[in-house]
């Protein structure tokens, strides 16, 4: 028995081939004898039953000739799925169609971080195919009647080539993936006190109309609990702010793409944020990290000191130095100070390997008294 | 063609009102940013207000809060400003303009000229 | 408020002169940056947006740059119809300001 896999809503081919290579007789049936189409010798395609009921079925009248009686099958549906008959030179071909229909829940049009889960339904109880996806890119994925792919990536969007394998006979169709999220995932600014701070949330993705809410919500470092520092609505890309917090002053841009400006890079800001952005007709949110590292310099009472406030790696040196002098090195990577500094200049670094990650000079003028 | 008209211009006393109106044609109106910009006598441009299409959002200037009041109606392709509490230093052009798609004002109308004078 | 800050607010040039108008924005406003042309009587006209995106039908002579808090317009070759009044408009947010203007006149 041949088998043949199909696509519900596409075309199938089923062959039927004479030995002679050359046209003959020859007549398709259902398993119940009930026939579909042929030709009796004149050239002419029969068909069999009302025109209504067989008009998704067809031939191809060019291939006759060279001994080739195929039953084209349009518009496939899963009621297709079973046995269909070739009689041709006294002899009958059995041909088995499986239909599948493939369905993506919860679609193809989904938020980072979401799964995917594809499904390959068929009224014929076969053996488990192989389903194969594969990027563009690249990336392999693979299951059976159930294929998923979890925690999607902004890159995994764009069009996957699809194979289902079923005794050694493939079909292909093809999906069209949309990942929607945030070009980074996490972001760090790193400010001298004083500065202004720029954050930026530029999506991955560009669709005309898109309309949803966000919230930034602020875990300072020296506070015991996050706080929301702005809420804002989205629509196209028009962005306007319902409510912002009266400290610090935030200004929203109002367009895309996302960007928050905070004016002055304080202590008590230092810390990590997370911009959420709710999509409509969206299950889900969209989420961004950011972190705010501030640097703080300052000569008190005979001390100079160096301090950084905010997320820092085990992996960065906190260093304060002094034109051609040695440099004072911190050991708890934060905090570095100098007991009666010299006049001159000193230089705070804050850096990671031989990436200096921020700097901040300070006038040492005499003991006591300092110029930024 | 793209156009706008404004209209309702005058003299009015201090503490007067006033409704400007301006009339759209050649665009899909409600999808729109439309914003009023004034400019007195010799002066630079000033922002006074602008209205979203999408959203109906409102937004205006300090100077004019809680005396100007800028609204549309989509179905009538017209924007409005009503003006109260009218001081001397609103005496000024006032222009009535559209946002682009990507909401700047690109096209402008000749302005009406408001006068607050006793 | 955004304040803007634009110079000179006038200067004198010959036509053929490469002009140059600067304005500077209070706290960073990305590219958010509009220009503007005003002749005496008449409403403005929009040149440049994004700070350095020409509008259809502006002459290529003007061009635009910057980002954050510094920008600005060039006329690279100065022609009659080009003297008027240049204003800069910072559109990252509300409320919307303008530069104070830069009236380029015939030396």
């Known amino acids: 028995k041949t088998l043949v896999l199909g696509k519900e809503g596409e075309s199938a081919e089923l062959p039927c081939e004479s030995s002679q290579k050359k046209i003959t007789v020859f007549t398709w049936k259902f398993s119940d004898q009930r026939k579909i189409l042929g030709q009796h010798g004149k050239g002419v395609l029969i068909r069999g039953g009302s025109p209504s009921q067989f008009d998704r079925f067809d031939s191809k009248k060019g291939a006759w000739e060279k001994g080739s009686f195929p039953l084209i099958i349009n518009k496939l549906k899963m009621e297709d799925s079973q046995t269909y008959i070739c009689e041709l030179e006294n002899r009958k071909e059995e041909v088995e169609l499986w239909v599948f229909k493939v369905t993506f829940s919860p679609g193809t049009s989904l938020l980072q971080g979401q799964s995917l889960t594809l499904t390959l339904d068929s009224n014929s109880k076969v053996s488990n195919p192989l389903t194969e996806c594969k990027h563009k890119k690249g990336k392999v994925v693979s299951g059976s009647k159930v294929l998923s792919m979890s925690n999607l990536r902004v890159q995994d969007s764009d069009f996957w080539n699809c194979t289902v394998t079923l005794d050694q006979k493939k079909n292909w169709f093809g999906m069209t993936l949309s990942v929607l999220g945030f070009q980074k995932a996490s972001s760090i600014v790193y400010k001298k006190e004083g500065e202004q701070v720029e954050f930026s949330f530029p999506l991955a993705f560009t669709v005309e109309k898109l309309t949803g809410s966000g919230e930034l919500w602020w875990q300072a470092e020296r506070a015991s609990s996050s706080k929301s520092w702005i809420t804002f609505d989205l629509k196209n890309k028009e962005v306007s702010v319902k409510r912002v917090t009266q400290d610090p002053k935030l200004q929203m841009g109002k367009k895309l793409p996302l960007h928050l400006t905070l004016p002055q890079a304080l202590p008590q800001y230092a810390g990590s944020g997370n911009l959420t952005l709710a999509l409509e007709a969206k299950t889900g949110k969209l989420h961004q990290e950011v972190n705010l590292v501030v640097m703080k310099v300052a000569q008190l009472n005979n001390t100079l000191t160096c301090e950084v406030m905010g997320p820092t790696s085990p992996k960065m040196r906190l260093t304060l130095k002094q034109e051609n002098q040695e440099a004072r090195v911190s050991e708890e990577q934060k905090v570095v100070q100098v007991v009666a500094p010299e006049t001159g200049l000193w230089q705070c670094l804050l850096s990671e390997g031989d990436k200096v990650k921020m700097d901040s000079r300070i006038q040492v003028l005499s003991r006591g008294v300092n110029q930024t | 063609e793209v156009q706008l008209l404004e209209s309702g211009g005058g003299l009015v006393q201090p503490g007067g009102s006033l409704r400007l109106s301006c009339s759209a044609s050649?665009?899909?109106?409600?999808?729109?940013?439309m914003s009023w910009v004034r400019q007195a006598p010799g002066k630079g441009l000033d922002w006074v207000s602008s209205i979203s299409g999408l959203t109906g959002n409102t937004y205006h200037a300090d100077s004019v809060k809680g005396r100007f009041t800028i609204s549309r109606d989509n179905s009538k392709n017209t924007l409005y400003l009503q003006m109260s509490s009218l001081r001397d230093e609103d005496t000024a052009v006032y222009y009535c303009?559209?946002?682009?798609?990507?909401?700047?004002?690109?096209?402008w109308g000749k302005g009406t000229t408001v006068t607050v004078s006793s | 408020a955004i304040q803007m800050t634009q110079s000179p607010s006038s200067l004198s040039a010959s036509v053929g002169d490469r002009v140059t108008i600067t304005c500077r924005a209070s706290?960073?406003?990305?590219?958010?940056l509009g220009w503007y042309q005003q002749k005496p009587g008449k409403a403005p006209k929009f040149l440049i947006s994004a700070a350095s995106s020409l509008q259809s039908g502006v002459p290529s002579r003007f061009s635009g740059s910057g980002y954050g808090t510094d920008f600005t317009l060039t006329i690279s070759s100065l022609q009659p119809e080009d003297f008027a009044t240049y204003y800069c408009l910072q559109d990252y947010t509300y409320p919307r300001t303008f530069g104070q203007g830069t009236k380029v006149e015939i030396k």
């Open positions: 706290q960073g406003i990305r590219n958010d």
């Open positions: 050649g665009f899909t109106f409600s999808d729109y940013v």
């Open positions: 303009a559209k946002d682009n798609e990507d909401y700047y004002m690109d096209v």
